[in-house]
Amino acid sequence: EVEKTACPSGKKAREIDESLIFYKKWELEACVDAALLATQMDRVNAIPFTYEQLDVLKHKLDELYPQGYPESVIQHLGYLFLKMSPEDIRKWNVTSLETLKALLEVNKGHEMSPQVATLIDRFVKGRGQLDKDTLDTLTAFYPGYLCSLSPEELSSVPPSSIWAVRPQDLDTCDPRQLDVLYPKARLAFQNMNGSEYFVKIQSFLGGAPTEDLKALSQQNVSMDLATFMKLRTDAVLPLTVAEVQKLLGPHVEGLKAEERHRPVRDWILRQRQDDLDTLGLGLQGGIPNGYLVLDLSMQEALS
């Protein structure tokens, strides 16, 4: 807490300007009117205040707005935003995308801080859903943002927002998240033609079921191994050798380099060795010729 002291004669601030950098902490406290500060917040960023001086300015705003800052002030906080705690931010009501962008810009190039996470949470909850413009903005600043959301939170993403998602935004998503995002992407891109559709849907295929992979195999898509390796194992296992060959096209020879990794390894174990041999890649581990394959899960379902 800064002690309350009278402002020295002639030092009362008429506006927020460079002269204030020479004020001691107690002088800032005594001589800068909080209401003046609030109306001229946009000037603070251009002045090289010390961290201690910024603490005083924050304290003045806290006193003026104990229930939380208005958006007109929040939008111009600039580097003062870095002084805010998650508790401070929880009092705010941020509705403008411009305000959100302005504050994210301050934190640009850094990991997502607890303050930023709280700000985003407040903003998204205020909007009710992750609309396209918001998603566009958030993934531009934090490519991994989408994958930091729980499957429950992702369910509030409308299919129209999927257009804003870039492949790198999904890099750190796990299968549970892709399970939620894939049906939305399928819906969003449903009116595109074959090759364009595949380019857009490719990053989401980690959530695709077997029947969709079978359908893709009929469309000459030439899926690369990076995409194939992200597919759900349970979706890959029922695919035949012919279907995988069609799905991968010229990339099929890459199966050899990945034959000991999931899901390729598990898929190989389910194929007849005869069928694997037709690929001419030397893949080993298939079901030997003459062996009968019993699907025990099907037997249990019938009994």
Epitope: P167, Q168, D171, T172, G206, D224, L225, A226, F228, M229, K230, H251, E253, G254, L255, K256, A257, E258, E259, R260, H261, R262, P263, R265, L281, G282
Partner: antibody, heavy 119, light 106 residues
């Protein structure tokens, strides 16, 4: 520009463990397996194993089974190799190397981490 | 496991001279890859899929071969080519490297 930055040299005692890291930058981490290769002084290269960052699926050269443990942290694009029960035979330079999924070669290599096991 | 035997183990060449080194495999493989390593540095990919030049590699390097016999050729030796060269296979598990050919400048 693609870079694989490895942790610095290690001098450790026999019987202990060590964890070497390899931080990738400049490309999509999940489009590549991270492989590890051993090279003893004046000798050839030995493939240890690799890990797929999407599934955490690992494969090891049988010779290094139980000796090396490979892990990844996708969020920081970092691969790790832990070497256990160290002996003087483990004294070597260890490289991480990037292998594009579906390809059989290593297109980028880390600068190497020198491990010295000595009492 | 597949064994790759490189020969010669050590060789020297004068600047401008043509250099050829071989990599023999005990079992047939689909592709061979070649790496160059200079003292104190990491290996660098030179040739992938037997004959394809890696990005940034000078065109004086070339690779050829099939089955069990492969070779790396430098059409005109330069001082900066002095290094150890390794072949590698990925056709059979575990993935193996040859013992290396050390190329010195005369």
């Amino acid at each position: 520009e693609v870079q694989l930055q490895q942790s610095g040299p290690e001098l450790v005692k026999p019987g202990t463990s060590v964890k070497i890291l390899c931080k990738a930058s400049g490309d999509t981490f999940t489009a590549y397996n991270m492989d590890w290769v051993k090279q003893r002084h004046g000798q050839s290269l030995e493939w240890i194993g690799d890990i797929n960052p999407n599934t955490d699926s690992t494969i090891y050269n049988q010779k290094f089974e139980g000796k090396a443990i490979l892990t990844v942290d996708k969020s920081s694009s970092t691969a790790y190799m832990e070497l256990r029960s160290l002996t003087s035979e483990d004294t070597a330079v260890y490289y991480c190397a990037r292998r594009k999924l579906g390809r059989g070669y290593f297109d980028y290599w880390g600068q190497g981490t020198t491990l010295t096991v000595s009492s | 496991q597949i064994v790759l035997t490189q020969s010669p183990a050590i060789m020297s060449a004068s600047p401008g001279e043509k250099v050829t080194m071989t990599c023999s495999v005990n079992l047939s493989v689909r592709y061979i890859y070649w790496y160059q390593q200079k003292p104190g540095s990491s290996p660098r990919l030179l040739i992938h899929d037997t004959s394809n030049l890696a990005s940034g590699v000078p065109v004086r390097f070339s690779g050829s071969g099939s089955g069990t016999s492969y070779s790396l050729t430098i059409s005109r030796m330069e001082a900066e080519d002095a290094a150890t060269y390794y072949c590698q296979q990925w056709s059979s598990f575990p993935y193996t490297f040859g013992g290396g050919t050390k190329l010195e400048i005369k």
